[in-house]
């Protein structure tokens, strides 16, 4: 008889990414005997929770917990029964909850309490629901991308860990309520809030990170809507022929539009707003989001935030990817250079509603907003982060790496489950030379 080699036992981990617009559940898996390898943890499955983000249940917190049930039931099917008790389960909430915490700490606590109550009812090893800081969100997204692309370490043929020659990849994340930029830098930060030191696999990394609250896709759209109401009484970024009823209460209820709120307004009033497909006026409207005139440091991105010059290659994911992919795939426009991105944005912004609908059949939910978001992305990269044609060549727009969604969730789990050692492991078990 011959010994049959058993497949290596798998371990599992679950992260609920509670974003501002929706919650996604990610189930990860990895071979138990290779926990310290880089790029060994991968996505097993995912599930998008129906309805809005947990912060949208501020007035009915119990529904925040209830909303997660469908995906948690899927997790019960995706993870083997004998692994339930050893499967860590985390919930991390991001900018939507950070915003709610600004306006109503009590409601925030109740929402977290409600989701905790739901999560503790499941047989997994629940390890808490918490709100990530902007810095956490940026750094964990950076860790995810570089872990999946195996930029931290390589396993050498001589049976020991070796550091690859290639550098790390910067990470840019565009969520619903905030946007993050994170990259390795050699220059010390002039603002300690923007510097993070990491020790991974025996290597030291100095990382610059910043999260801009209210600069996520949905909040930017709300702010532009508020500006359009204030300045134009029409929306230059919306396509001509498109009009909708805007409920003033919804526009001004976010802390992000507080500064644009009129002294007095009828909160139950609705205003009819029409699009005009005016790329030039849309550009002006978007440029109002960036204050680049004052900088208390030697160099800034915008709004007086310190930023060293962008260096190396970058991966831009989440709404960065979806928007640029729309320009490329649906509109059929090249976006390989900053100039092409600008031209593609202008072309999209000059489309009428009829033209846009003809280009994108069977799809309408976010169609009127692609112009504004594309315009914002172009300006964020060029005017905000100061990418030029040369540095922009190093930016790739992706949603996945190694079949795993790029975002903060994996990095968060790797950190909390100690799956990335700070120092090099000793001699590899089972390595021998004949």
């Amino acid at each position: 008889t011959q010994d049959v080699r058993e497949p290596p036992a798998l371990k599992y981990g679950i992260v609920l990414d509670a974003g501002s617009s929706h919650t996604s559940m990610f189930v990860y898996k990895w071979p138990a005997d290779k926990e310290n390898d880089t790029g060994i943890v991968g996505q097993h499955s995912s599930c998008d929770v129906r309805g809005g983000g947990i912060s949208s249940y501020a007035n009915d917190p119990s529904r925040a917990g209830q909303s997660l049930v469908e995906c948690l039931e899927q997790a019960l099917r995706d993870v083997p029964k004998d692994r339930y008790a050893s499967t860590p389960l985390y919930l991390g909430a991001t900018a939507g909850m950070r915003l709610l915490n600004l306006t109503s700490p009590e409601a925030t606590a109740k929402v977290l309490e409600a989701v905790t109550q739901t999560l503790t009812r499941y047989p997994f090893d629940f390890r808490g629901a918490r709100i990530l800081s902007g810095q956490d969100e940026g750094v964990f997204g950076w860790v995810t991308a570089n872990y999946l692309l195996e930029n931290f370490i390589k396993y050498g043929w001589v049976g020991r860990w070796i550091r690859p020659r290639k550098g790390t990849l910067g990470a840019m994340d565009l969520g619903g309520a905030s946007t993050q930029i994170t990259f390795e830098t050699t220059s010390p930060s002039e603002d300690p809030d923007n510097e993070v030191h990491l020790r991974l696999y025996g290597q030291h990394y100095r990382v610059y990170t910043h999260s801009f609250l209210c600069y996520g896709r949905d909040q930017v759209l709300q702010r532009l809507l508020a500006s359009a109401l204030q300045i134009h009484r029409f929306h230059p970024c919306w396509p001509k022929g498109y009009s909708t009823q805007v409920l003033l209460r919804e526009v001004y209820q976010s802390p992000c539009t507080m500064g644009q709120r009129p002294q007095t307004f009828n909160s139950s009033a609705t205003v009819s707003l029409s699009g005009t497909s005016n790329a030039a006026l849309c550009r002006d409207l978007v440029s109002g989001l960036f204050n680049i005139s004052s900088c208390p440091f030697s160099q800034c991105s915008f709004n007086g935030v310190f930023q060293p010059p962008v260096a190396g290659n970058f991966i831009a994911f989440s709404a960065f990817y979806y928007t640029v992919d729309f320009l490329k795939t649906v509109m059929g426009l090249p976006v390989g250079t900053l100039k092409q991105l600008e031209d593609a944005t202008e072309t999209t912004c000059n489309q009428t509603w009829a033209e846009l609908q003809a280009r994108v059949p069977g799809q309408q939910t976010r169609l009127p907003d692609y112009c504004a978001v594309a315009m914002f992305i172009h300006q964020l990269l060029s005017r905000g982060y100061r990418f030029d044609e040369r540095s922009f060549r190093g930016v790739v727009f992706e949603k996945k790496a190694a079949d795993t969604a790029v975002g903060w969730a994996l990095g968060y789990m790797l950190n909390l489950t100690n799956l990335i050692p700070a120092d090099l492991p000793g001699l590899r078990k089972g390595t021998h030379f004949s």
Epitope: T329, V330, A354
Partner: antibody, heavy 120, light 109 residues
Framework: QVQLVQSGAEVKKPGSSVKVSCKAS????????VSWVRQAPGQGLEWMGR????????RYAQKFQGRVTITADESTSTAYMELSSLRSEDTAVYYC?????????????WDQGTLVTVSS | SYELTQPLSVSVALGQTARITCSGD??????VYWYQQKPGQAPVLVIY???NRPSGIPERFSGSNSGNTATLTISRAQAGDEADYYC???????????FGGGTKLTVLG
């Protein structure tokens, strides 16, 4: 009432090309789009590509990229689909379908289809 | 790439309600369209935008769509409803129309 009328059945040799036409009678392509969908014997529907004549905008399914060309002549309200490098698996009924803005550019009018047989 | 999955066949007794499902990743976020195809004929649009009927389509045909499943419901099924039914949706990521594999509806009795 708009009707679509396609060209007749074709028998082609492997490696050759076929060009199928689709004429809108009783209407024009103004504000409409045209998609081409094929159906192999006993199989389901497979989208090949679309054209928005008034925008000069075309999109092709990745599977057919480089092998299919969709064009339109607005003056005669006729759309064309040319498929090259034919192989036996391309034997199918080829439908042209009008995409209407009233139905969010889904296919509201279909022709009876053109049978293309690829055989040596 | 985006895929829509339908059951190969569904049977319903004459006069009863038939339900044909179409599942796809987060399909509830997209609009779904349903086509009826009888043997030797071209497809006919029976439902657009999830739950709307084109003129000429009986009220017995209705649609719903949420989460990962869209459903075509045919109430008081008649012999004339026997056909293949295809769901379709536009995949924004690849800028293409996607059809489900089709479901053969059999009306018994």
């Amino acid at each position: 009432q708009v009707q679509l009328v396609q060209s007749g059945a074709e028998v082609k040799k492997p490696g050759s090309s076929v060009k199928v036409s689709c004429k809108a009678s009783g209407g024009t392509f103004d504000s409409y789009a045209v998609s081409w969908v094929r159906q192999a014997p006993g199989q389901g529907l497979e989208w090949m590509g679309r054209i928005v004549p008034w925008l000069g905008f075309t999109r092709y399914a990745q599977k057919f990229q480089g092998r299919v060309t969709i064009t339109a002549d607005e003056s005669t309200s006729t759309a064309y689909m040319e498929l090259s490098s034919l192989r036996s698996e391309d034997t199918a009924v080829y439908y042209c379908a009008r995409e209407s803005p009233g139905y969010r550019y889904s296919f509201d009018v279909w022709d009876q289809g053109t049978l293309v047989t690829v055989s040596s | 790439s985006y895929e829509l999955t339908q059951p190969l066949s569904v049977s319903v007794a004459l006069g009863q309600t038939a339900r044909i499902t179409c599942s796809g990743d987060a399909i509830g976020e997209k609009y779904v369209y349903w086509y009826q195809q009888k043997p030797g004929q071209a497809p006919v649009l029976v439902i657009y935008d999830d739950n709307n009927r084109p003129s000429g389509i009986p009220e017995r045909f209705s649609g719903s769509n949420s989460g990962n499943t869209a459903t075509l419901t045919i109430s008081r099924a008649q012999a004339g409803d026997e056909a293949d039914y295809y769901c379709a949706s536009y995949d924004l990521q690849q800028a293409r129309w996607v059809f489900g594999g089709g479901t053969k509806l059999t009306v018994l009795g």
